[in-house]
């Protein structure tokens, strides 16, 4: 059986303790010897029984008296072997010895769980000397214990090379229910079960756990610890804490939110970063997530025209960076922008619808159907041509660009004249005779030179030649039409 | 198997009194508390209350407290229902029943009639 | 104490049919459990926490819900099915039942 100091007899009903019977103290607990004030012990068992071998080393010492009488083996006195107290209390225990005073130099080490302890620790030996034999009493106190504290305590004396172990005093050190692992903060799809776990330790044991759902109850009887909860689902936002109780009362977990997993918000804040002729890139600020990642977004977007047929245009992309560049618009015109993002549980409302333009583009076409004729009466080259489709002016168009490039005998120079958006026939003057001029068109906006036409070249005479056929923009197929003349 | 068996049917005098027994096995008679619900001739189910039968501790609903007793013996892992001064409209089927996360009546005894007539 | 009302009281079913028993509390719950009863037997649990079903329990029953309102649906009625349904609340003591539903199959 084990010694044991108990601090105080608690029966509880159905929760029988770790020591049932026995005793237990908050005071300090004297063991073995008188104590100087005169203080009663708590209440102290043997631990050996009559007749029992101690259970600690003995030390047979080889010397005898000048009698020659040979001396009892020496050992540690038996003292208390478990000692029961609550945290924050002062505790103090000892070891005892008679040594013959044959032997010098003994010295008393105390040990805590099989590492000797050092240093500063609360350790007092004092010395008794008799006629034959010394007490030595070894004190150990601890002023404030704490669970770390918890362990098996001995005491070892070294004597001619033999050891002397004394029995282990086990010390318990009981307090409220400590956790170890608690609930943790889950989001969770709606109405899918799923599980909590909650543990705590004593000393003392067992411990025993109650869940609390939003301040119910959810177990009306206590489980022992470790106890996993499932939650059978939730419809709604719920919190959940644990309570940890022993014999000496209850510790409370921290309350646990458990969210519900949604469809996020909808973005907010959708605004046009830059515009060009042909891609606007917006930015947002995305909704709340519905306790979800997520997962992308999907930019929709329709022409705002109000004679257009109102399709939608989808951009799917990525959630970050919050940014997207849409391409492939025209130019030039008015677009509705709304962005929506998704997250595992499914997709938000689309935000607010935004309005944004485009800018003008340079053309995206030439003009079309360019001639080009020799007026020999006055010297000039005669041009016409078609301007190009609005649809792909991409713009207000603000004029032409004529390029008429001049080559004879290895010379060639090329020259660019502006021509105001009104008309659609130019005429320049012939620069060389004898010559092959090359004419190409580009159409101009503000937003830029759209492409020039493919060239039509004219064979420019030396002076005295009679009249001339136009030259025109080649039939497709057409690669390089000259026209002599 | 869990199973819940309960006393059989009782014919009483008004000012009587009667102990219904309901006997557990199948499990742990202390992990789970024990339910006491009533149910009147052609009504529904009125819950009477609960005892706690790792404490013993019981808790009785309003509308059953003074003349109603739940107990235990863990020995024989049984609660019982005792009634004091009965009245004619005691007269009800009275059912046990385990008391399990979030109030979940998982099983249920076979219930037991107590007629109150002079 | 919250008090539960079901509806209908009473309904009288044709095989195959789908039926919807209704439970209102008169103050949000936390979960709604639903029993089975047939005369002179002790009730049967049916559907615990609002939506699962217990064991042995036919998967044509289905309990849905939230907060004061909750529905235990039968897909397609079989005869066995008569019965009488009870709702239970679980979040405020006392316990509480509703008055019952008695199905009867036409």
């Known amino acids: 059986a084990i010694t044991e100091a108990r601090e105080e007899a608690k029966p509880y009903p159905l929760f029988p303790g770790p020591f049932p019977g026995s005793l237990q103290t908050d005071h300090t607990p004297l063991l073995s010897l008188p104590h100087a004030s005169g203080y009663q012990p708590a209440l102290m068992f043997s631990p050996t029984q009559p007749g029992r071998p101690h259970t600690g080393n003995v030390a047979i010492p080889q010397v005898t008296s000048v009698e020659s009488k040979p001396l009892p083996p020496l050992a540690f006195k038996h003292t208390v072997g478990h000692i029961i107290l609550s945290e924050h209390k002062g505790v103090k225990f000892n070891c005892s010895i008679s040594v013959p005073n044959i032997y010098q130099d003994t010295t008393i080490s105390w040990w805590k769980d099989g590492k000797e302890l050092l240093g500063a620790h609360h350790a007092i030996t004092q010395f008794y000397p008799d006629d034959e034999v010394t007490a030595i009493i070894a004190s150990f106190s601890i002023t404030s214990v704490q669970r770390s504290d918890n362990g098996s305590y001995i005491c070892k004396m070294k004597i001619n090379n033999e050891e002397i172990v004394s029995d282990p005093i086990y010390i318990e050190v009981q307090g409220l229910p400590h956790f170890t692992k608690q609930p943790e903060s889950m989001n969770v799809t709606r109405n899918t079960a799923f599980n909590l776990t909650c543990q705590a330790v004593g000393p003392p044991e067992p411990v025993n756990i109650f869940w609390v759902q939003n301040s119910s109850r959810v177990n009306e009887q206590p489980e022992k610890s470790p106890s996993v909860l499932t939650v059978p689902g939730l419809t709604e936002m719920a919190v959940f804490s644990c309570e940890a109780h022993n014999d000496k009362g209850l510790t409370v977990s921290k309350g646990v939110q458990i969210n519900i997993k949604a469809i996020p918000s909808p973005p907010t804040e959708v605004s046009i970063r830059n515009s060009t002729a042909h891609s606007i890139l917006i930015s947002w600020v995305p909704g709340f997530d519905g306790y979800s990642p997520f997962r992308n977004c999907s930019i929709q977007v329709k022409e705002a025209d109000p004679l257009s047929n109102g399709s939608v245009m989808i951009f799917n992309t990525s959630a970050l960076p919050h940014l997207y560049q849409i391409k492939q618009l025209q130019a030039l015109a008015n677009y509705s922008i709304g962005v929506s993002c998704m997250n595992e549980i499914g997709w938000s409302a689309v935000s607010p619808w935004i309005l944004a333009s485009t800018t003008e583009g340079a053309p995206s076409v030439a003009p079309l159907n360019v001639t080009v004729f020799l007026n020999e009466s006055s010297d000039n080259v005669d041009i016409r041509w078609m301007k190009p489709p609005t649809k792909q002016q991409d713009g207000e168009l603000v004029g032409y660009r004529i390029s008429h490039v001049w080559q004879s005998a290895g010379i060639s120079k090329e020259l660019l004249e502006e021509v105001g958006q009104n008309g659609s026939r130019a005429r320049i003057s012939v620069q060389v005779h004898n010559a092959t001029c090359t004419v190409r068109i580009a159409a101009v906006t503000r937003g830029g030179v759209g492409p020039f036409s493919d060239p039509v070249k004219i064979f420019i005479p030396a002076h005295g030649w009679v009249d001339y056929a136009p030259s025109s923009t080649p039939a497709p197929g057409n690669a390089d039409p000259v026209l002599i003349i | 198997q869990i199973q819940l068996v309960q006393s059989g049917s009782e014919l009483k005098k008004p000012g009587a009194s009667v102990k219904v027994s309901c006997k557990a096995s199948?499990?742990?008679?202390?992990?789970?508390?024990m339910n006491w619900v009533r149910q009147a001739p052609g009504q529904g189910l009125k819950w009477m209350g609960w005892?706690?039968?790792?404490?013993?501790?019981?808790t009785y609903a309003d509308d059953f407290k003074g003349r109603f007793v739940f107990s235990l013996d863990t020995s024989v892992s049984t609660a019982y229902l005792q009634i004091s001064s009965l009245k004619a409209e005691d007269t009800a089927v009275y059912f046990c029943?385990?008391?399990?996360?979030?109030?979940?009546?998982?099983?249920w005894g076979q219930g037991t009639l107590v007629t109150v007539s002079s | 104490e919250i008090v539960l009302t079901q509806s209908p009281d009473f309904q009288s079913v044709t095989p195959k049919e789908k039926v919807t028993i209704t439970c209102r509390a008169s103050?949000?719950?936390?979960?709604m459990h639903w029993y089975q009863q047939k005369p002179d037997q002790s009730p049967k649990p049916w559907i615990y926490?609002?939506?699962n079903l217990a064991s042995g329990v036919p998967s044509r029953f289905s309990g849905s819900g939230s907060g004061t309102d909750f529905t235990l649906t039968i897909n397609s009625l079989e005869a066995e099915d008569a019965a009488t349904y009870f709702c239970?609340?679980?979040?405020?003591?006392?316990?509480?039942f509703g008055q019952g539903t008695k199905l009867e199959i036409k």
């Open positions: 029943a385990t008391y399990g996360h979030y109030a979940w009546f998982a099983y």
């Open positions: 199948g499990y742990t008679f202390t992990n789970y508390g």
């Open positions: 005892i706690n039968t790792y404490t013993g501790e019981p």
């Open positions: 103050s949000s719950v936390s979960y």
């Open positions: 926490a609002t939506s």
């Open positions: 239970q609340q679980w979040g405020t003591k006392p316990l509480t």
